[in-house]
Amino acid sequence: KFSKQSWGLENEALIVRCPRQGKPSYTVDWYYSQTNKSIPTQERNRVFASGQLLKFLPAAVADSGIYTCIVRSPTFNRTGYANVTIYKKQSDCNVPDYLMYSTVSGSEKNSKIYCPTIDLYNWTAPLEWFKNCQALQGSRYRAHKSFLVIDNVMTEDAGDYTCKFIHNENGANYSVTATRSFTVKDEQGFSLFPVIGAPAQNEIKEVEIGKNANLTCSACFGKGTQFLAAVLWQLNGTKITDFGEPRIQQEEGQNQSFSNGLACLDMVLRIADVKEEDLLLQYDCLALNLHGLRRHTVRLSRKNPIDHHS
């Protein structure tokens, strides 16, 4: 559950984030799992740890393997695993499936292609973009911050898009490339006021103290690709990241699904090792888009162990 796949190309920079997160003040130790050998923090090393980040500058095929990160606080330790694979550069233009990031869909109204993982790097604009290995040129293509915007999208715009940027570390530059597929949706989509499918308003969820619990916030927003649609969790009206309880984490990516043709988003809130004080919190599921926002609240209650005595 707390394992994450990461991949990169040899001789490029690769930065991996620990799948377990905590406050910035917590220390994070990294180990190479096979040997249990500690990853150094000194930046003079080609591979070094920097808090929640593990940096390969540059990466080598031999770096492939499983890395362990341990988030340490005064009261607990949390362990995560990063499964890193470094591939040799391809001589031909085809990008194999195992190097592809998640596919994104676009339509005439919404044609943003985000450069995957770029937020982990110290880069400066502009990004370079390629489609099927050809540099993108012309006024229809606009590199804006960390994404590419395509004007007047057509079905021919579908394909594999690669972003290329330079990561700077202490004055040294390293190249990074990332590729994802872009598909063009032809259907006439529409957008609705968010409808929260789960949880029900004022739902009570039974949990067991000491066990893990998952809460899912699920909402639908219309048909087709949705712009500015989001679902998120809050604790007592506070963002999860600001609440500062490492046991309670929001799943990083939002899962998009299509239910009865409707575009829906799910966000899972994971509560590790449920404690008594968690029962006092209000868990708010927010769904928002261009039309408006809606809120549902969940509370936790203690699940009584089944009495086996006759």
Epitope: F193, Q201, G237, D242, G292, R294, R295, H296
Partner: antibody
Amino acid sequence: EVQLLQSGGGLVQPGGSLRLSCAASEFTFSNAWMSWVRQAPGKGLEWVSTISGTSRYTYYADSVKGRFTISRDNSKNSLYLQMNSLRAEDTAVYYCARDQDGRLDYWGQGTLVTVSS
Amino acid sequence: DIQMTQSPSSLSASVGDRVTITCRASQNIGSWLAWYQQKPGKAPKLLIYRASTLQSGVPSRFSGSGSGTDFTLTISSLQPEDFATYYCQQSYSTPYTFGQGTKVEIK
């Protein structure tokens, strides 16, 4: 103590424009959602508009949609309401307020907008 | 849009009285309800949020209850400074909507 200081009200002719400002202090403005609420003379409160901390999300009452624009400048800790095509029924005291999860926990002192020829 | 209906629209009471104001939503809003107090010429002041949570600094004689569609604001022992107009507001979904207000006057 959280403070919201408003400015920019006044008398304007029907069809005219006006820009209201709200200067915030003593809280992390860039993280806060903000709202505008108005109150016509002798009447109740009416929500006008809300903006998220990053300006990504903006919402409006149907009565002002297409005429009013909410915006913010986080570098100046300031919230704005640009009001165009003003009508007599827009005459009201306008309040800016911090929006904490939909509840409006701190309010500006209010500024009177009068639309009249 | 969600309609909020307050009752009564006005009431007369004496210092020390127990006062109850009700607010009804046109649909289930869970606990997403706030209560405000407004005095003439002043900005509204938040009293209660999430239907029953007392805002910091508000006297404990104010309390809120209810869930779903029916909500109540209670002032256990009315004080001279409590004579004002009270509004409920839903934040379940945009557009946020207010009740029409209840004016509490001196008997």
